[in-house]
């Protein structure tokens, strides 16, 4: 069964800046990746970025840079300033859609006790 992993890291240089990394562990080719915060995209979460392997990347504030790391993993950097900036207990979710197999999603957040730069 395919799985999704999520890592959330707070940048040491900017304490309110986050890096989210997500990956898909499965055999299907990825058609779309959706990154959201505040919960899964279908349960009240807000979309931060949508990554399509052919048609490009769309991102919304406070997302600063979304990119493909491999064919089955992505990363997203969030800006740390402003009213819409994330806090330490924010939940981030990644949903990987593979055709015709379907979609798999997982969520993660920064561990409460973690130091800046530590992976979740």
């Amino acid at each position: 069964t395919p799985e999704v992993w999520v890592q959330v890291r707070m940048e040491a240089t900017e304490l309110s800046s986050f890096t989210i990394r997500c990956g898909f562990l499965g055999s299907g080719s990825i058609s779309l990746v959706t990154v959201s915060w505040g919960g899964p995209n279908g349960a009240g979460g807000t979309t931060l970025a949508v990554l399509h392997p052919e048609r490009g990347i769309r991102q919304w504030a406070p997302a600063r840079q979304a990119r493909w790391e491999t064919q089955s993993s992505i990363s997203l950097i969030l800006e740390g300033s402003g009213a819409s900036s994330p806090c330490a207990n924010t939940t981030f979710c990644c949903k990987f859609a593979s055709f015709p197999e379907g979609s798999w999603e997982a969520c993660g957040s920064l561990p409460p006790s973690s130091d800046p730069g530590l992976s979740a």
């Epitope: 299907g28 080719s29 058609s31 779309l32 899964p40 995209n41 279908g42 349960a43 949508v50 399509h52 052919e54 048609r55 949903k95 859609a97 593979s98 055709f99 015709p100 197999e101 379907g102 979609s103 999603e105």
Partner: antibody, heavy 120, light 107 residues
């Protein structure tokens, strides 16, 4: 304008074969996943077979596995369904449909359908 | 397989009144739910995708809502041209499955 035009339907005896075709125009065919959906007279919708844009993955309804083969020719902007060992229960209107990745794989455009009648 | 169960099977509503069609999934389908309208002798047409997003050209009297396993299609003010069969559809997990359809008529 997106257009999907099916052809190849008709009357065939049980055990016979048909090859359905779907000619696509008005969009970059090679970038989209495609499906065949059927509807028996007075009945609901049933996904028969699907193929992803890069022809890596396919799906078949359990009752047609081993009898039907989906294929596509991206150079000819065409989708096909080879149907062998046809049964009376395969009688239906067969629709060609396009899936939109950005819409959660919803089928955003459909052809008018081609009627397949399996009867002796 | 994920089973999509629509209710009611048929519905009669007066012109200008609200019509509500429900769809229940046998397990969570995230937000990968679409609604289609099919008129006699025509192919289905996409109305709603991602639970609540209207497809291009769809009148704003059509709206979708729900999450997880329970979803609703609402027509706020029924028009004569809305007479059709409506299907919900999940594309969350293969095999994609449809509801059995709800026939909407004018009372």
């Amino acid at each position: 304008e997106v257009q999907l035009v099916e052809s190849g339907g008709g009357l065939v005896q049980p055990g016979g074969s048909l090859r359905l075709s779907c000619a696509a125009s008005g969009f970059t065919f090679s970038s989209y996943h495609m499906s065949w959906v059927r509807q028996a007279p007075g009945k609901g919708l049933e996904l028969v077979s699907a193929i992803n844009s890069n022809v890596i993955s396919t799906y078949y309804l359990d009752t047609v596995k081993g009898r039907f083969t989906i294929s596509r020719d991206n150079a000819k902007n065409s989708l096909y369904l080879q149907m062998n060992s046809l049964r009376a229960e395969d009688t239906a209107v067969y629709y060609c449909a396009r899936h939109e990745d950005y819409y959660g794989f919803a089928m955003d455009y459909w052809g008018q359908g081609t009627l397949v009648t399996v009867s002796s | 397989d994920i089973v999509m169960t629509q209710s009611p099977d048929s519905l009669a509503v007066s012109l200008g009144e609200r019509a509500t069609i429900n769809c229940k999934a046998s397990q969570s389908v995230s937000n990968d739910v679409a609604w289609y309208q099919q008129k006699p002798g025509q192919p289905p047409k996409l109305l709603i995708y991602y639970v609540s997003h209207r497809f291009t050209g769809v009148p704003d009297r059509f709206s979708g809502s729900g999450s997880g396993t329970d979803f609703t299609l609402t027509i706020s003010s029924l028009q004569a041209e809305d007479v059709a069969v409506y299907f919900c559809h999940q594309a969350y997990r293969s095999p994609w499955t449809f509801g059995q359809g709800t026939k909407l008529e004018i009372k």
